[in-house]
């Protein structure tokens, strides 16, 4: 497996351990969501990844400006996503880059699944049911 | 000892079975057991749900209904070590859409 | 409002023990994350060790194997027992709870102090 399939709770480095919440949220188009990470801020910075699907790699999460803000307060790291849209579907990383040793830690990953209908073809599937 | 990453989640229709892999690289007599969290609910120690089957700790829950959603967790001990836990995967039970009462054709719908 | 009350701080020698308690008047059902940080004259507040809903712990590299974080759900008390206390550890401690949607509470401090 490659390495960032696996993890482990190393007893090492001081940012050795990022702990993120929740696992998993569902929620409507358009409703604001947040996501946590907890860590020792003292050992470097926090960033945000994304990737759509399980099997991909994450990628850096491009923040859409007034829509999307990350923010720290010493140890508690937050990703709010307003307006939330069918793209913003997948799994959210936190991610910490060590300042003494440059090893980089994961949290688990935060999925988004944005609900309701995305297309035309669903929504008369829809209407068809309820016919 | 590494614990691979699991899905986030998972979706099973109503009255499916659930598989749950805990991917880890221990030999075989690693020690691989099954909890659950409720969403939401952060209470400690999670529920306890047994051990984990075949090599790869695989937990199977059959016949799943709405009670059984929440996070599943594995927990691998080799020896006296301390245990590693897997991220979770979010078990989400789909109901199956309702069968029209007049299950008939479209052609028959428009006469 | 949600108070976390501390004790246990105080004046020690270097290589004695404390233990500090931080009770939170809140649910435990709405805890993610029991912690306690630090503040010594002139610097920054700094993680010491946490605990979280699943138990798991983290830990400041200069208090590793000398301090250990743990917690009574029922009470929402979250303790830190120090050993092996250094002047180095002397700071105001501060317990922090953390809920599953972000809010965050600090106590008001309890002050540590190591010296002979």
């Known amino acids: 497996a490659r390495s960032e399939d696996r993890y482990r709770n190393p007893k090492g480095s001081a940012c050795s351990r990022i702990w993120q919440s929740p696992r998993f949220i569902a929620r409507k188009r358009g409703f604001t969501v947040k996501m946590h990470c907890y860590m020792n801020s003292a050992s470097g910075n926090v960033s945000w990844l994304w990737k759509q699907e399980m099997d991909e790699n994450p990628q850096q999460l491009k923040l859409e400006k007034g829509r999307m803000e990350e923010s720290q307060n010493e140890s508690l790291a937050t990703l709010t996503i307003q307006g939330i849209r069918f793209e913003d579907n997948g799994i959210y990383f936190c991610q910490q880059k060590c300042n003494n040793t440059s090893e980089v830690y994961q949290g688990c990953g935060t999925e988004l699944r944005v609900m309701g209908f995305s297309t035309l073809a669903q929504l008369k599937q829809r209407n068809t049911l309820k016919d | 000892l590494w614990m691979h990453k699991v899905p986030a989640s998972l979706m099973v229709s109503l009255g499916e079975d659930a598989h749950f892999q805990c991917p880890h690289n221990s030999s075989n007599n690693a020690n691989v057991t099954w909890w659950r969290v409720l969403h939401g609910n952060y209470t400690w120690p999670p529920e306890f749900l047994g051990p984990g089957e075949d090599p790869n700790g695989t937990l199977i829950i059959q016949n799943v209904n709405k009670s059984h959603g929440g996070i599943y967790v594995c927990r691998v001990q080799e020896g006296n070590e301390s245990y590693q836990q897997s991220c979770g995967t979010y078990l989400r039970v789909r109901q199956p859409p309702p069968r029209p009462f007049l299950d008939m054709g479209e052609g028959t719908k428009n006469r | 409002d949600v108070q976390l009350q501390e004790s246990g701080g105080g004046l020690v020698q270097p290589g004695g023990s404390l233990s500090l308690t931080c009770t939170a008047s809140?649910?435990?059902?709405?805890?993610?994350?029991r912690a306690w940080h630090r503040q010594a004259p002139g610097k920054q507040r700094e993680l010491v060790a946490a605990?979280?809903?699943?138990?798991?712990?983290m830990y400041a590299d200069s208090v590793k194997g000398r301090f250990t974080i743990s917690r009574d759900n029922a009470k929402t008390t979250v303790s830190l027992q120090m050993d092996s206390l250094k002047p180095e550890d002397t700071a105001v401690y501060y317990c922090?709870?953390?809920?599953?949607?972000?809010?965050?509470?600090w106590g008001q401090g309890t002050q540590v102090t190591v010296s002979s």
């Open positions: 605990i979280n809903s699943d138990g798991q712990t």
């Open positions: 922090n709870v953390v809920t599953p949607n972000g809010q965050q509470y």
């Open positions: 809140i649910s435990s059902l709405t805890i993610w994350v």
